[in-house]
């Protein structure tokens, strides 16, 4: 029977800069029941606080609700593991909410084949930003990426869409069924997961050439 091993805070993520969650990996438990607590203070302050919500983020997590999430402030946090034989502390982690945003995937992905009479046909792709993100405040710039491939192909073709929420693709294989997905990331932060795939059948008369 031993004191617990050193825990590690390995990830913090925010869906929208308004709340965030951090997760830790326990060290060895020393063969005894072990309690974990996450404590932190904000840069420029010395008053320590404890994790307000150990439940929402699942096991070995701390969720910071709106009233605990401060923009433009760095959080300095650590996890304490304690059993009957002693305690151990994780290294301190410095967290700035601005840099840990990972949005939900974009919504309402719509894909349509457009075949104008006077121009080349194209695939028209449209989507909406995730609901948790408020783009009107100006705090967020979301960038988008599209990927698509024929259903049976191994390789994805990736297109960067910038800030726009619609995109045209001209070069497609006629008669093929395509999978299309979109994801987003803030200017600072992490790519979202890919949206659920939307399928589109490309007509056999879809011409790639002039």
């Amino acid at each position: 029977q031993l004191p617990p091993g050193k825990p590690e805070i390995f990830k913090c993520r925010s869906p929208n800069k308004e709340t965030f969650t951090c997760w830790w990996r326990p060290g060895t438990d020393g063969g005894l029941p072990t309690n974990y607590s996450l404590t932190y203070h904000r840069e420029g302050e010395t008053l320590m606080h404890e994790c307000p919500d150990y439940i929402t983020g699942g096991p070995n997590s701390c969720h910071f609700g709106k009233q605990y999430t401060s923009m433009w402030r760095t959080y300095i946090m650590m996890v304490n593991a304690t059993n009957q034989m002693g305690s151990s502390f994780s290294d301190e982690l410095y967290v700035d909410v601005t840099y840990i945003v990972q949005p939900d995937p974009p919504l309402e992905l719509a894909v349509e084949v457009k075949q104008p009479e006077d121009r080349k046909p194209y695939l028209w792709i449209k989507w909406s930003p995730p609901t948790l993100i408020d783009l009107k405040t100006g705090w967020f710039t979301l960038l988008y990426e599209i990927r698509l491939k024929p259903e049976k192909a191994a390789e994805w073709e990736i297109h960067f869409a910038g800030q726009q929420t619609e995109f045209k693709i001209l070069s497609l294989h006629p008669g093929q069924k395509y999978l299309v997905q979109v994801r987003c990331k803030p200017d600072h932060g992490y790519w979202s997961a890919w949206s659920p795939a939307t399928f589109i059948q490309i007509p056999s008369d879809f011409t790639m050439n002039d």
């Epitope: 607590s37 420029g44 302050e45 008053l47 606080h49 404890e50 307000p52 609700g65 009233q67």
Partner: antibody, heavy 118, light 106 residues
Framework: EVQLVESGGGLVQPGGSLRLSCAAS????????MNWVRQAPGKGLEWVAY????????YYADSVKGRFTISRDNSKNTLYLQMNSLRAEDTAVYYC???????????WGQGTLVTVSS | DIQMTQSPSSLSASVGDRVTITCRAS?????LHWYQQKPGKAPKLWIY???KLASGVPSRFSGSGSGNDYTLTISSLQPEDFATYYC?????????FGQGTKVEIK
Amino acid sequence: EVQLVESGGGLVQPGGSLRLSCAASGFTFSSFGMNWVRQAPGKGLEWVAYISSGSSIIYYADSVKGRFTISRDNSKNTLYLQMNSLRAEDTAVYYCTRFYGYIPFDYWGQGTLVTVSS
Amino acid sequence: DIQMTQSPSSLSASVGDRVTITCRASSSLIYLHWYQQKPGKAPKLWIYDTSKLASGVPSRFSGSGSGNDYTLTISSLQPEDFATYYCFQGSGYPLTFGQGTKVEIK
């Protein structure tokens, strides 16, 4: 509606003990840091003690350190202050208050009077 | 310890007057908070994070400042504003109040 209701105050002799309680309702008690603040008759406010949401962090004012113990029972939504070795200068109204995020003392109880006198 | 010094400790003013209370911290703060207390009542949060008015606080109140120096201003004093005001720092242990400023009727 957030409510904090203190109880347990009264008259006690110097050197005696008293345990104050604060019953909380109307919010998720286990998510909030809690405090005791006191006010001697005709004097200003003095912070006494702080306890974090899960009791991992506890702070005391120097004037009560070693004599007072703050604790909480999240299953009962109750905050406590065990006061030992009481002195005349501990005579005050004791208020239970909460930390809302980083906003200190957004709600206060009505207070309970502790009188230390022989 | 961070000492909080309020001035003045008391003031007399008339309804309609502009009133300013100052609070100086012995160490630089990021935020400062203000509380209002009336005789026989529990204090109330009045201004938090230096300049944000608590729920129900009239807009004639304002807070400002940074670093070591902070002010609470009442633009036009009303009868219900006569009370004692306390500044407070919750950034560092031990948590500390100013000694209070009593606003009385002239």
